[in-house]
């Protein structure tokens, strides 16, 4: 058993049918010695008396808010949550496996640049009685500071019969140098509590590996005289690290017909312009990627050919 | 990624082309190592990230773009040594810091070159003959060093009398390649920045 926060405790249980569970001793936070009784949640049934209460915690029915009273007055509370260990592996019931980029990916994180700011998000089908708390650091043995905000519900989607809820959090490394070569990964830890179930999820990454630039901005077409060709031009996204000559991007320019089946023409360039043939009803799209470190491509920025 | 690559203009900052070749070569070598050594811990998540140049050179600090010198987090250690300028210093306007920067890059390359050559000698003794260093990568390191053209003492190749532990050598190779790729990215960024200035 360990303390998650004041008056909230997590009991770790080896989870299998007929498991013996864990013996837990609760102590009433009071100078009083006599006339103390204990109850669980809203029930008025007295579970025991005395300054301490010994319980065998086996299942969720044994978890909850234990309260010690004296003469109708509440003295203190202890909330017990359960953390299930199933065959040596901590349970992952609360969050959905996003399966990208690999199986057992519960937390996904992205950064728009090298400033040390990043966003993580996760999915769940649970809509109520759910709380998250996020901590982060650079490295784990001698951790350096990363500050995270509160997790917020950022999207709701309908997936088949189920509703899916996306939560996200923004974090910022306290003293980040965009040019630094990372040798210690960022660690992100999410505590999830659903009713009386506690779970924790972690992700470890280098900022360089989660970079996904914003799409190029100011995408424009300039028709070339007496030609089906157009000059496409764009700019670096505002959110990209500066100077751009140091943090350079490379670009992919795509000409896509109206039908998804039509052949796509693609050109790769390090410049912020390209000359392409504009077909009728086609659209031109441009996306960006770090020129020197192949992390994710940005989403496409698009303009119609007409 | 295999993308069409433009040939640089002859007037371009001389080292840019070499640094781009270096990054391509080390990335290819790392990819080959990951595939060949699939049963070894060779991915970024599995290895310890060590920098053999730590406390010996300070490339990131010495080569910091002017725009980032205002960022206090980037200025935590700036102990750099001065070495006379080499052929990549295309104009007299080249500052003292630029000389420091390029000499630091040269020292990095020299250290990695020694490590890779020592490692290759060990790998050639492996009865499994599983992996060797790409000669192209070693040649590209050499070319960039020549382009930088700094006068510096030659570092003797390390020789080891004891029987090599091939498992450890292959893991060390992965660690070295990951670190060298990161340094090659920094070198490329620096060359691009200097070329633009």
């Amino acid at each position: 058993i360990w303390e998650l926060k004041k008056d909230v405790y997590v009991v770790e249980l080896d989870w299998y049918p007929d498991a013996p569970g864990e013996m837990v001793v609760l102590t009433c936070d009071t100078p009083e010695e006599d006339g103390i009784t204990w109850t669980l949640d809203q029930s008025s049934e007295v579970l025991g008396s005395g300054k301490t209460l010994t319980i065998q915690v086996k299942e969720f029915g044994d978890a909850g808010q234990y309260t010690c009273h004296k003469g109708g007055e509440v003295l203190s509370h202890s909330l017990l949550l359960l953390h299930k260990k199933e065959d040596g592996i901590w349970s992952t019931d609360i969050l959905k496996d996003q399966k990208e980029p690999k199986n057992k990916t519960f937390l996904r994180c992205e950064a728009k640049n090298y400033s040390g700011r990043f966003t993580c998000w996760w999915l769940t089908t649970i809509s109520t009685d759910l709380t998250f708390s996020v901590k982060s650091s650079r490295g784990s043995s001698d951790p350096q500071g990363v500050t995270c905000g509160a997790a917020t519900l950022s999207a709701e989607r309908v997936r088949g019969d189920n509703k899916e809820y996306e939560y996200s959090v923004e974090c910022q490394e306290d003293s980040a140098c965009p040019a630094a070569e990372e040798s210690l990964p960022i660690e992100v830890m999410v505590d999830a509590v659903h009713k009386l179930k506690y779970e924790n999820y972690t992700s470890s990454f280098f900022i360089r590996d989660i970079i996904k630039p914003d799409p190029p901005k100011n995408l424009q077409l300039k028709p070339l005289k007496n030609s089906r060709q157009v000059e496409v031009s764009w700019e670096y996204p505002d959110t990209w690290s500066t100077p751009h000559s140091y943090f350079s991007l490379t670009f992919c320019v795509q000409v896509q017909g109206k039908s998804k089946r039509e052949k796509k023409d693609r050109v790769f360039t390090d410049k912020t312009s390209a000359t392409v043939i504009c077909r009728k009803n086609a659209s031109i799209s441009v996306r960006a990627q770090d020129r020197y470190y192949s992390s994710s491509w940005s989403e496409w920025a698009s303009v119609p050919c007409s | 990624r295999n993308l069409p690559v433009a040939t640089p203009d002859p007037g371009m900052f001389p080292c840019l082309h070499h640094s781009q070749n270096l990054l391509r070569a080390v990335s290819n070598m790392l990819q080959k190592a990951r595939q060949t050594l699939e049963f070894y811990p060779c991915t970024s998540e599995e290895i310890d990230h060590e920098d053999i140049t730590k406390d010996k050179t300070s490339t990131v600090e010495a080569c910091l773009p002017l725009e980032l010198t205002k960022n206090e987090s980037c200025l935590n250690s700036r102990e750099t040594s001065f070495i006379t300028n080499g052929s990549c210093l295309a104009s007299r306007k080249t500052s003292f810091m630029m000389a420091l920067c390029l000499s630091s890059i040269y020292e990095d390359l020299k250290m990695y070159q020694v490590e890779f050559k020592t490692m290759n000698a060990k790998l050639l003794m492996d009865p499994k003959r599983q992996i060797f260093l790409d000669q192209n990568m070693l040649a590209v390191i050499d070319e960039l060093m020549q382009a930088l053209n700094f006068n510096s003492e030659t570092v003797p190749q390390k020789s080891s009398l004891e029987e090599p532990d091939f498992y450890k050598t292959k893991i060390k190779l992965c660690i070295l390649l990951h670190a060298f790729r990161i340094r090659a990215v920094t070198i490329d960024r620096v060359m691009s920045y200097l070329n633009a200035s």
């Epitope: 299998y16 007929d18 299942e59 592996i89 199986n103 | 049963f39």
Partner: antibody, heavy 115, light 112 residues
Framework: QVQLVQSGGGVVQPGRSLRLSCAAS????????MHWVRQAPGKGLEWVAF????????YYADSVKGRFTISRDNSKNTLYLQMKSLRAEDTAVYYC????????WGQGTMVTVSS | SYVLTQPPSVSGTPGQRVTISCSGG????????VKWYQQLPGTAPKLLIY???RRPSGVPDRFSGSKSGTSASLAITGVQAEDEADYYC????????????FGTGTKVTVLG
């Protein structure tokens, strides 16, 4: 005490269907994940499928994906394996078992796929 | 499709020490715990070892398990005639959990 009693096995022709049941008692069935494991005659153990405690997630071996469906009825304390498009290579003793560091196995039920 | 490899058979005389190996990889045994089962003819498997080296109550202490890196082993010290059975190791793969990964199985024969 924990008990898993299996039923539903038998002889079936290739291409036909069969449903296996596993009745649980002696524990809170709705709190635990459950597996199906099979063993072909003279061969080793092969995992078939898993279902979460609440039925929200199901996992299958590649060899049965798209043909077998694992399900549970927590109100009846029963686990099921619906097997469709049966093949000769599905012939085996099928076991249900609880998920956890200490597990309990059903007695096994024989499924023979033969024409 | 077995990823955990065991020797097909091992044998020993009563009282001898018998060991069975179970060889896997970084993503299974290297990352997860190992169980060992004993299966007597015509019966369901019986758990002998869980969590690499822990014995459930009721399992004789002549059975012991260990794990090192990407391999595990089961030792029977002072093998007895009633230990003649098939033995299976089991683990998980970190990418496919909760799918159970079973070893190929080992037939233990007690001679004489």
């Amino acid at each position: 005490q924990v008990q898993l009693v299996q039923s539903g096995g038998g002889v079936v022709q290739p291409g036909r269907s069969l449903r296996l049941s596993c009745a649980a008692s002696g524990f809170t069935f709705s709190s635990y994940g459950m597996h199906w494991v099979r063993q072909a005659p003279g061969k080793g153990l092969e995992w078939v499928a898993f279902i979460r405690y609440d039925g929200s997630n199901k996992y299958y071996a590649d060899s049965v994906k798209g043909r077998f469906t694992i399900s549970r009825d927590n109100s009846k304390n029963t686990l099921y394996l619906q097997m469709k498009s049966l093949r000769a290579e599905d012939t085996a003793v099928y076991y249900c078992k609880t998920h956890g560091s200490h597990d309990n196995w059903g007695q096994g039920t024989m499924v023979t796929v033969s024409s | 499709s077995y990823v955990l490899t065991q020797p097909p058979s091992v044998s020993g005389t009563p009282g001898q020490r018998v060991t069975i190996s179970c060889s896997g990889g970084r993503s299974n045994i290297g990352s997860n715990t190992v169980k060992w089962y004993q299966q007597l003819p015509g019966t369901a498997p019986k758990l002998l070892i869980y969590g690499n080296d822990r014995r459930p109550s009721g399992v004789p202490d002549r059975f012991s398990g260990s794990k090192s890196g990407t391999s595990a082993s089961l030792a029977i010290t002072g093998v007895q005639a009633e230990d003649e059975a098939d033995y299976y190791c089991q683990s998980y793969d970190r990418g496919t959990h909760p799918a159970l990964l079973f070893g190929t199985g080992t037939k233990v024969t007690v001679l004489g």
